[in-house]
Amino acid sequence: SITGISPITESLASLSTYNDQSITFALEDESYEIYVEDLKKDKKKDKVLLSYYESQHPSSESGDGVDGKMLMVTLSPTKDFWLQANNKEHSVELHKCEKPLPDQAFFVLHNRSFNCVSFECKTDPGVFIGVKDNHLALIKVDYSENLGSENILFKLSE
């Protein structure tokens, strides 16, 4: 369960890959498409509103509530649209939705590797937003390997 309905904090940031490609959003045929691309030097980066929520970590639901918290984010590049995980298609999509947002719109925030962040699906632990063939996709991470896999690392810049 997400603690409270209001976020701890919000921030506006542009999202880029570990390799400095920009994540951009374009309205096409009344729906938004997500692109991973090299931006021209003078082109302004798209901003995303990140809302941060605190939630109980599933492995400690039976605990005393003190242990086992996680920080989750929702990502909204434009009003009323949020990034969502489509676990069946292993894809990341932009959907128009009303609050309360579905679980598919929440991602557990990880940080550390190279001061980048990673976004783990709330609905599918071990699956992260990543870059595949110049698109955002859902990527299963093998924990026996390095969690610093570059294709799931993103940079946030104001």
Epitope: T9, S59, D67, G68, K69, M70, H110, N111, L147
Partner: antibody, heavy 122, light 107 residues
Framework: EVLLQQSGPELVKPGASVKISCNAS????????MNWVKQSHGKSLESIGD????????FYNQNFKDKATLTIDKSSSTVYMELRSLTSEDTAMYYC???????????????WGQGTLVTVAA | DIQMNQSPSSLSASLGDTITITCHAS??????LSWYQQKAGNNPKLLIY???KLHTGVPSRFTGSGSGTLFTLTISSLQPEDIATYYC?????????FGSGTNLELK
């Protein structure tokens, strides 16, 4: 109850190495990176680095890159820190600490070991 | 690395007083700041995280505020058990860094 139990005090000679331990219990060990923090007498706290129990991946503060090595024994939920080429500057209390949030450092350190005092003296 | 500039380094106050400690980050850390209390001979204890969220079991006389680069810890109605050293710490980016500490003593 979450407990981080550290090994006892160490008196070591200059130039030698020492390996101290931190045993974790009361939570899913693999869910949280284990951090190490140094506190010299009467001084502030300094982050040394951390280790990911899932895969042994380490991060070191640049200041400790050549000083500390972090390792893990998953079977006993224990993290080790080896300090090498010790000098009087390394005399300090060393703490292991666990983050508040699963997966990220944003919420600070909620659980701390009791500390291991390492004294370097001839 | 993000530098955490904490002030004052020491502070004398009387029981019942309200005291304020300030922490200034060298760059924007949003609200990702924690405050710790450390009593002599003990390990640090988390008081406040995410700049203003009170950790479980911490008395409500402790309050944290701020965002971006400027943060404050306020202790109202100072109690004898509050005599300790207080540290701020940023959790926004690695390496994680601490303030230099504020030693609080009784007048």
């Amino acid at each position: 109850e979450v407990l981080l139990q550290q090994s006892g005090p160490e008196l070591v000679k200059p130039g030698a190495s020492v390996k101290i331990s931190c045993n974790a219990s009361g939570y899913t060990f693999s869910d949280y990176n284990m951090n190490w923090v140094k506190q010299s007498h009467g001084k502030s706290l300094e982050s040394i680095g951390d280790i990911n129990p899932k895969n042994g991946d380490t991060f070191y503060n640049q200041n400790f890159k050549d000083k500390a090595t972090l390792t893990i024994d998953k079977s006993s939920s224990t993290v080790y820190m080896e300090l090498r080429s010790l000098t009087s500057e390394d005399t300090a209390m060393y703490y292991c600490a666990r983050h508040y949030y699963y997966g990220s450092s944003y919420g600070g350190f909620v659980y701390w070991g009791q500390g291991t005092l390492v004294t370097v003296a001839a | 690395d993000i530098q955490m500039n904490q002030s004052p380094s020491s502070l004398s106050a009387s029981l019942g007083d309200t005291i304020t400690i300030t922490c200034h980050a060298s760059q924007n850390i949003n609200v990702w700041l924690s405050w710790y209390q450390q009593k002599a001979g003990n390990n640090p204890k988390l008081l406040i995280y995410a700049a203003s969220k009170l950790h479980t079991g911490v008395p409500s006389r402790f309050t944290g505020s701020g965002s971006g680069t400027l943060f404050t810890l306020t202790i109202s109605s100072l109690q004898p058990e509050d005599i300790a050293t207080y540290y701020c710490q940023q959790g926004q980016s690695y390496p994680l860094t601490f303030g230099s500490g504020t030693n609080l003593e009784l007048k």
